[in-house]
């Protein structure tokens, strides 16, 4: 009977118990982007550092070719921050001349790709107009939320303009996910 | 045999099971900073409320002298928001006179200190140029991500200008961490 | 003895073990808001999609009438992003005429309502001055943190101006919570 004493109650064990330390997890950090061919009508995807410095993947969560590969179905918390930097946006210069115009903008999208589904799914989007008055500018966009993912799903981070991404420090631009 | 029925499967028990409710967790909230001596060449660290209102520390996660002390090795989700407020940035005044200049900025860094390691490690940084056109301005910087921490590590939040932090409400400026 | 081998150690079982997959969780997404009566001196609450597209509620976490209902006491991670969009703020026009003035602003508040307590509690606030120089503008405010909640607590998201919320895409404006 002693063995039963510490077993989880009958009510709780329909879903299997599992140790937290063996759950799929990843934190990826920015690397300098090399010019690549982008898909037409789709924001370019960032590629990432997955093992040096603060970056890691563990427990079957793998990174390959700009994608985080989901090894197990479940609810995941997914997050990313992208820090952008640029020179004066043309938007403000044009506006100063008295002509209204569409503002410049910066956008981050966390996208899910499911092989059995033809179109990628946009999970999270952060988008911001940038109409700075002169000088250099820099700012982060942060995103994070929980999603139900299936084994084999792939996650990537797309940005509106890859050349504006601040790739200088691993703490400024990053991407991660963990099974809850 | 009955005792074995609900025991986790052999595959799952190499890492010990543990109840979620006993994991180290903390949510700290802003208090007014009093002028102090800052370390040279390092952004000043904020100090925090750890037990009143919405703030708490639990399960051996302790707060002391501006630091959250990590009581157990593992993967932690760490987050902070700092709301800044200020008057017109000098930057915009200079720019209006037609001279380009380096913008004012606001920065938040979540830093890890490991006693056995000489240099602090910057885990997360949010940095934003502030070139407001006149009037008062206010805005938050939010950060959050997962990191592998070791027992004894210490976490702090550093800011570029402590006097611009909005200390008025516990929901505007905060810092937290929890073991996954 | 075999049954005991994989049972959690004595130290770990005072808090009941439970499967992660059966914890209360929700991710709600934006829907177009219909004009409603707002409480005086309180920002209006958003209502949400809870089952279509990326939205879901599970394990007794229910959504009803703008509220997420907490079904079980514990520590929850709560998050929201609201994307705002608008035309040129009056603030900048007045300022250009040389008169200083109070800036326009956008604010998101995640609020907890406890039936036994007369006043709602503001858990999280993101507030930002908006003084754009001409043109349209758009930008997100993101919030997320951990709180100790009680069974029966209700969560809502309030915004300073419901008419500025971008309701066009489920990835731009969302609200979620999950038991840790």
């Amino acid at each position: 009977l002693k063995g039963q004493e510490f077993a989880p109650s009958h009510q709780q064990v329909y879903a299997p118990l599992r140790a937290d330390g063996d759950k799929p997890r990843a934190h990826l950090t920015v690397v300098r982007q090399t010019p690549t061919q982008h898909f037409k009508n789709q924001f370019p995807a960032l590629h990432w550092e997955h093992e040096l410095g603060l970056a890691f993947t563990k427990n079957r969560m793998n990174y390959t070719n700009k994608f985080l590969l989901i090894p197990e179905s479940g609810d995941y918390f997914i997050y990313s921050q992208v820090t952008f930097r640029g020179m004066t946006s043309e938007c403000s210069e044009i506006r100063q001349a008295g002509r209204p115009n569409k503002p410049d903008s910066i956008t981050v999208v966390i996208t899910k790709v499911t092989d059995s589904y033809p179109e990628p799914t946009q999970l999270l989007m952060g988008t911001k107009s940038v109409c700075e008055v002169g000088s250099n500018w820099f700012q982060p966009i942060y995103l994070g939320a929980m999603f139900s993912l299936q084994e084999g799903d792939k996650l990537m981070v797309n940005v509106s303009d890859i050349s504006l991404v601040d790739y200088t420090k691993e703490d400024k631009t990053f991407f991660g996910a963990f099974l809850l | 045999l009955k005792g074995q029925e609900f025991a986790p499967s052999h595959q799952q028990v190499y890492a010990p099971l543990r109840a979620d409710g006993d994991k180290p967790r903390a949510h700290l909230t802003v208090v007014r900073q009093t002028p102090t001596q800052h370390f040279k060449n390092q952004f000043p660290a904020l100090h925090w409320e750890h037990e009143l209102g919405l703030a708490f520390t639990k399960n051996r996660m302790n707060y002391t002298n501006k630091f959250l002390l990590i009581p157990e090795s593992g993967d932690y989700f760490i987050y902070s928001q700092v709301t800044f407020r200020g008057m017109t940035s000098e930057c915009s005044e200079i720019r209006q006179a037609g001279r380009p200049n380096k913008p004012d900025s606001i920065t938040v860094v979540i830093t890890k200190v490991t006693d056995s390691y000489p240099e602090p490690t910057q885990l997360l940084m949010g940095t934003k140029s502030v070139c407001e056109v006149g009037s008062n301005w206010f805005q938050p910087i939010y950060l959050g991500a997962m990191f592998s921490l070791q027992e004894g590590d210490k976490l702090m939040v550093n800011v570029s200008d402590i006097s611009l932090v909005d200390y008025t409400k516990e929901d505007k400026t905060f810092f937290g961490a929890f073991l996954l | 003895l075999k049954g005991q081998e994989f049972a959690p150690s004595h130290q770990q079982v005072y808090a009941p073990l439970r499967a992660d997959g059966d914890k209360p969780r929700a991710h709600l997404t934006v829907v177009r808001q219909t004009p409603t009566q707002h409480f005086k001196n309180q920002f209006p609450a958003l209502h949400w999609e809870h089952e279509l597209g990326l939205a879901f509620t599970k394990n007794r976490m229910n959504y009803t009438n703008k509220f997420l209902l907490i079904p079980e006491s514990g520590d929850y991670f709560i998050y929201s992003q609201v994307t705002f969009r608008g035309m040129t703020s009056e603030c900048s026009e007045i300022r250009q005429a040389g008169r200083p003035n109070k800036p326009d602003s956008i604010t998101v508040v995640i609020t907890k309502v406890t039936d036994s307590y007369p006043e709602p509690t503001q858990l999280l606030m993101g507030t930002k001055s908006v003084c754009e120089v001409g043109s349209n503008w758009f930008q997100p405010i993101y919030l997320g943190a951990m709180f100790s909640l009680q069974e029966g607590d209700k969560l809502m998201v309030n915004v300073s101006d419901i008419s500025l919320v971008d309701y066009t895409k489920e990835d731009k404006t969302f609200f979620g919570a999950f038991l840790l």
């Epitope: - | 007014r32 002028p35 008057m87 008062n136 402590i162 006097s163 611009l164 200390y167 008025t168 | 109070k102």
Partner: antibody
Amino acid sequence: QVQLVQSGAEVKKPGASVRVSCKASGYTFTGYYMHWVRQAPGQGLEWMGWINPNSGGTNYAQKFQGRVTVTRDTSISTAYMELSRLRSDDTAVYYCTSGGSFDAFDIWGQGTMVTVSS
Amino acid sequence: DIVMTQSPSSLSASVGDRVTITCRASQSISSFLNWYQQSPGKAPKILIYGASRLQSGVPSRFSGSGSGTDFTLAISSLQPEDFATYYCQQGDSTPFTFGPGTKVDIK
């Protein structure tokens, strides 16, 4: 400990200028705004302006614009307030004050009495 | 400029009394309201910041409330050292402005 020490009392003639110094110690001088507040005899408190010791940027109350100049010397952690074209109603105790945020005042100097009299 | 008004301008009370002082701003100042105590011949001392938050080291008998335009300072049980002048100050926008003060003296 954290303190602000001001220069001594001054007696000035109308039309003259006065310069009051404020030496900070026990904290990082460049990390916190320094303000000047005055109090006429038997009257309330009146904010004059601030300096950001880090950047040197200033902000003055309109009432004193053109007459007041606040400066600092970071090498000796000292702020200065100069008020020109003195009038008899400038007779007051002048305080330097700083705080953990730019909009409130935790630490105060002991005050400097400036008397303007012909 | 934001104009701050206080009432009453003076009050007489006894040790142990509960005292309340009100402060009103001419326009909304959110929670950017601070309270100071000044004893004769001394520099002011901050008591309450952010309208309702007690400055470290200040006795808990002092409390503040309010937001927007209307604010209150309360002293739950007056002590001999509390007889002084109390000022409110707005930190919402420059020029920062103080109320005219409320003098609390012994009845």
